[in-house]
């Protein structure tokens, strides 16, 4: 029985130009993390396999940085990064926990402004 | 339970437009994933056409790109796929499936044949 | 696009033999790789994503591994209901693309 929960930054926003942790926690399970993914809905973005090590896809290896952790830093972010990202916990032998964050990034001028989402 | 059903005509004129139906039961289609079209040639080859989003954004195959649109009617837990200017070379099995981010297709109807033929 | 390729497009075994087919990717693809079973007349069944993990409710005698370019899926002992075209299929950037199937015989 799958009895984990997964906590996430929630909804957050950056500043154009500037970086940004996605992060996610496994929690309430005793269930060893074989492998994170990090994806968005049409592609993948980072993998940390506990055999295999960090993979990061070609067309992120510029701007994603591995970490904190089994996080991920997006550097150098632009309008076009706002969206959904997704953070796939697998798990034994529990299964699969997937968490999801709300990414928006704002021009720098409007950042400053103190527009922000709220963390649930 | 989770279930898929596609729906439409199994005949379809060259030139015209193919339009097909997938119903969706027990899950809410804007709850969570990506619904998806996907369909399988005559020789077995597997082809994904598109989706769609739970909160509808769409993406579709480069290959399809000018030529199909997927939509859905919430209040109906359906959606839609429509190929434009079909010829023979769409002959296909079409189904649709559920896909979950980090994972394969999970879901999938029974599947539909469509055949283009004057 | 990644190009999936599953070499054997046949493949003849006996029940309670061990049978591996392998499915290579164009590009390094890491374990992003499903494996699908279709019987005569039915939609692809899911049995196997992120190269290894089985779904829920799959016999154990199916396994998956590799990663990179890569991919295997076994089944340790044929039984008869296996008889079925199993795909390869990446999930990691659309467009998803499958493998062109191997189709299992059993003597």
């Known amino acids: 029985m799958m009895t984990g929960t997964i906590e996430t930054t929630g909804n957050i926003s950056a500043e154009k130009g500037g970086s940004i942790i996605l992060q996610c926690h496994l929690s309430s399970t005793t269930a060893q993390v074989t492998q994170v993914n990090w994806e968005q809905q049409d592609q993948l973005l980072a993998i940390c396999n506990a055999d295999l090590g960090w993979h990061i896809s070609p067309s992120f290896k510029d701007r994603v940085a591995p970490g904190p952790g089994l996080g991920l830093t997006l550097q150098s972010l632009t309008v076009n990064d706002t969206g959904e990202y997704f953070c796939i916990y697998h798990t034994y032998p529990d299964g699969t926990y997937t968490g999801r964050i709300f990414l928006e990034v704002l021009e720098s001028s409007v950042a400053e402004h103190g527009a922000r989402f709220q963390i649930p | 339970d989770v279930q898929l059903q596609e729906s439409g005509p199994g005949l379809v004129k060259p030139s015209q437009s193919l339009s097909l139906t997938c119903t969706v039961t027990?899950?809410?289609?804007?709850?969570?994933?990506?619904w998806n079209w996907i369909r399988q040639f005559p020789g077995n080859k597997l082809d994904w056409m598109g989706y769609?989003?739970?909160?509808?954004?769409?993406r579709y195959n480069p290959s399809l790109k000018s030529r199909i649109s997927i939509t859905r009617d919430t209040s109906k837990n359906q959606f839609f796929l429509r190929l434009n200017s079909v010829t023979t070379e769409d002959t296909a099995t079409y189904y649709c499936?559920?896909?979950?981010?980090?994972?394969?297709?999970?879901?999938w109807g029974q599947g539909t044949l469509v055949t283009v033929s004057a | 696009d990644i190009v999936m390729t599953q070499s054997h497009k046949f493949m003849s075994t006996s029940v309670g033999d061990r049978v591996s087919i392998t499915c290579k990717a164009s590009q390094d693809v890491s374990t992003t790789v499903a494996w699908y079973q279709q019987k005569p007349g039915q939609s692809p069944k899911p049995l196997i994503y992120?190269?290894?993990y089985r779904y829920t409710g799959v016999p154990d005698r199916f396994t998956g591994s590799g990663s990179g370019t890569d991919f295997t899926f076994t089944i340790s002992s044929v039984q008869a209901e296996d008889l079925a075209v199993y795909y390869c299929?990446?999930?990691?950037?659309?467009?998803?693309?499958f493998g062109g199937g191997t189709k299992l015989e059993i003597n």
């Open positions: 499936a559920r896909r979950e981010v980090g994972q394969g297709f999970t879901y």
């Open positions: 769609i989003t739970y909160s509808g954004d769409t």
């Open positions: 299929q990446q999930h990691y950037s659309v467009p998803w693309t």
């Open positions: 027990g899950y809410s289609i804007t709850s969570d994933y990506a």
């Open positions: 992120s190269a290894s």
